[in-house]
Interface confidence: low
């Protein structure tokens, strides 16, 4: 009878999460008599994976019938693999001893490495909105993948971005890995309808990358452009003041009319016109009766957009000298 060899032919076994893994172990001799046990890891802290004689191992089955007299195959199959199952597995031969079995020989070990798919990338934008020409950061996160090699790309409206930084953690050996990437995007006024996409490619995805997206509409604030015009009414003693608020985003906008510093009306933008680029326009009117004015009227329009500081635009309504005289006569 030749000297016992414990043969574990695979040094490396790559398994996808959820699959079954077969760990092969054959022996070349039946001597010395004693059990073959499976362990994960080495040393005193090693974990018992399978013992034919005792214990409950619901996920482990033997490949051949260990009760057969001449059985030399001690291979096992572990079902429903999870990342926690990664590690090096050893089949170990014990000989009988007193009072306990004594370890006789170990196989060289089979490293089980996980093939795990990355989670769907989650893209998050900046905490606060920024205005065009400013740079905002978007973060993409994906986790739970193995092996460590992974490729991440950023796109804006389908065009690849180059200004980003990516980290894969941890740096050393692990059962699974996570990736975090931050892309810097310079905002343009037309970006309300733009999208950034994070694309993750991994060996487990078989050439079909995962994508996560974020809308720049969540990150951008386009401040309005303001225009005030006045139009005399046919009656002659009334003036229509038109206040046009153009190309703003997001929608929330409040407008306050002040006549000589006194609030005469406050309104919240409601009936908006949407532009092709996703920004909005809004028009507000104020009818001013000039017949009972004896001095020039300073009309101020105050616009508060998306909680920002109010922007003022003023217009002076000049009252004619004839009106001033009439008004002066009336007060005497």
């Amino acid at each position: 009878e030749e000297e016992l060899q414990m043969i574990q032919p695979e040094k490396l076994l790559l398994v996808a999460v959820g699959e079954s893994a077969t760990l092969n172990c054959t022996v070349t001799s039946l001597l010395p008599v004693g059990p073959v046990l499976w362990f994960r890891g080495v040393g005193p802290g090693r974990e018992l994976i399978y013992n034919q004689k005792e214990g409950h191992f619901p996920r482990v089955t033997t490949v051949s019938d260990l009760t057969k007299r001449n059985n030399m195959d001690f291979s096992i199959r572990i079902s429903s693999i999870t990342p926690a199952d990664a590690g090096t597995y050893y089949c170990v031969k014990f000989r009988k001893g007193s009072p306990e079995n004594v370890e006789f020989k170990s196989g060289p070990g089979t490293e089980m490495a996980l093939r795990a798919k990355p989670s769907a990338p989650v893209v998050s934008g900046p905490a606060a909105r920024a205005t065009p020409e400013h740079t905002v950061s978007f973060t993409c996160k994906s986790h739970g993948f193995s092996p460590r090699d992974i490729t991440l790309k950023w796109f804006k409206n389908g065009n690849e971005l180059s200004d980003f930084q990516t980290n894969v953690d941890p740096a050393g050996q692990s059962v699974s890995y996570s990736i975090r990437s931050t892309a810097r995007v310079v905002l343009a006024p037309w970006d309300v309808r733009s999208q950034v996409t994070c694309e993750v490619a991994h060996v487990t995805l078989q050439g079909d990358p995962l994508r996560g997206t974020a809308n720049l509409s969540e990150a951008i604030r386009v401040p309005p452009t303001l225009e005030v015009t006045q139009q005399p009414m046919r009656a002659g003693n009334q003036v229509n003041i038109t206040y046009q608020v153009r190309n703003f985003y997001p929608q929330n906008l409040q407008l306050t009319w002040l006549e000589n510093g006194n609030v005469c009306r406050t309104e919240t933008a409601s009936t908006l016109t949407e532009n092709k680029d996703g920004t909005y326009n809004w028009t507000s009117w104020l009818l001013v009766n000039t017949s009972d004015q004896r001095d020039d009227v300073v009309l101020t329009c105050q616009v508060k957009h998306d909680g920002q500081l109010a922007v003022n635009k003023s217009l002076v309504l000049e009252v004619s000298a004839h009106q001033k005289d009439q008004s002066s006569d009336a007060t005497h």
Epitope: E3, L14, G109
Partner: antibody, heavy 119, light 112 residues
């Protein structure tokens, strides 16, 4: 039993490239390493490089062949490929593919492909 | 790279007699798992190489048990207990501890 079947003999001009294929049957292709070993006429065995198909495009190469050899694998057809460029007369050899466990023991060998480099 | 040195270069043998080939590595092939990553291959005339022994002493399935391997660290030996005519060819040792995998120069076994 695993069988590795290689493509046929090639005659090439110096400076050109050659691509040899190796199709595996009768066993799991992806989890094993495919190595390429060459043997010049009357000479010994020389390891060129290897690949574990499941890891995709990651291959390791002997320093001597770095930059001139490219080893690839197609999991869908269980086929490995070895491409050697900038051929010279001393590249005339029989090229073997071999299936190993991890990046070591070569348990199964192809029948070999003779590549002759001659002007 | 690990350098593998084989001896002798040529080995004339008589059928039925034992034969022995030596292989030395430039560094230890003993892995921390306790196994020596040293393989032996035989290339018969006109054929591809075939695996005989792996991990220094494990006999590959289907290989006759007249072949045996021994040794540890840097010195290894392949023994044929009783040479048969079909055993002629070139025997190579190979270290499988690290890449690049490297082979010995070969030992040509021929019948006297």
């Amino acid at each position: 039993q695993v069988q590795l079947v290689q493509s046929g003999a090639e005659v090439k001009k110096p400076g050109s490239s050659v691509k040899v294929s190796c199709k595996a049957s009768g066993g799991t292709f992806s989890n094993y390493a495919i190595s390429w070993v060459r043997q010049a006429p009357g000479q010994g065995l020389e390891w060129m490089g290897g690949i574990i198909p499941i890891f995709g495009s990651t291959a390791s190469y002997a320093q001597k062949f770095q930059g001139r050899v490219t080893i690839t694998a197609d999991e869908s057809t269980s086929t490995a490929y070895m491409e050697l460029s900038s051929l010279r007369s001393e590249d005339t050899a029989v090229y073997y593919c071999a299936r190993g466990v991890g990046d070591d023991t070569l348990t199964d060998w192809g029948q070999g492909t003779l590549v002759t480099v001659s002007s | 790279d690990i350098v593998m040195t084989q001896s002798p270069l040529s080995l004339p043998v008589t059928p039925g007699e034992p034969a022995s080939i030596s292989c030395r590595s430039s560094q230890s092939l003993l892995h921390s798992n306790g196994y020596n990553y040293l393989d032996w291959y035989l290339q018969k005339p006109g054929q591809s190489p075939q695996l005989l022994i792996y991990a220094a002493s494990s006999l590959q399935s289907g290989v006759p048990d007249r072949f045996s391997g021994s040794g540890s660290g840097t010195d290894f030996t392949l023994k044929i207990s009783r040479v048969e005519a079909e055993d002629v060819g070139v025997y190579y040792c190979m270290q499988a501890l690290q890449t690049p995998l490297t082979f010995g120069g070969g030992t040509k076994v021929e019948i006297k």
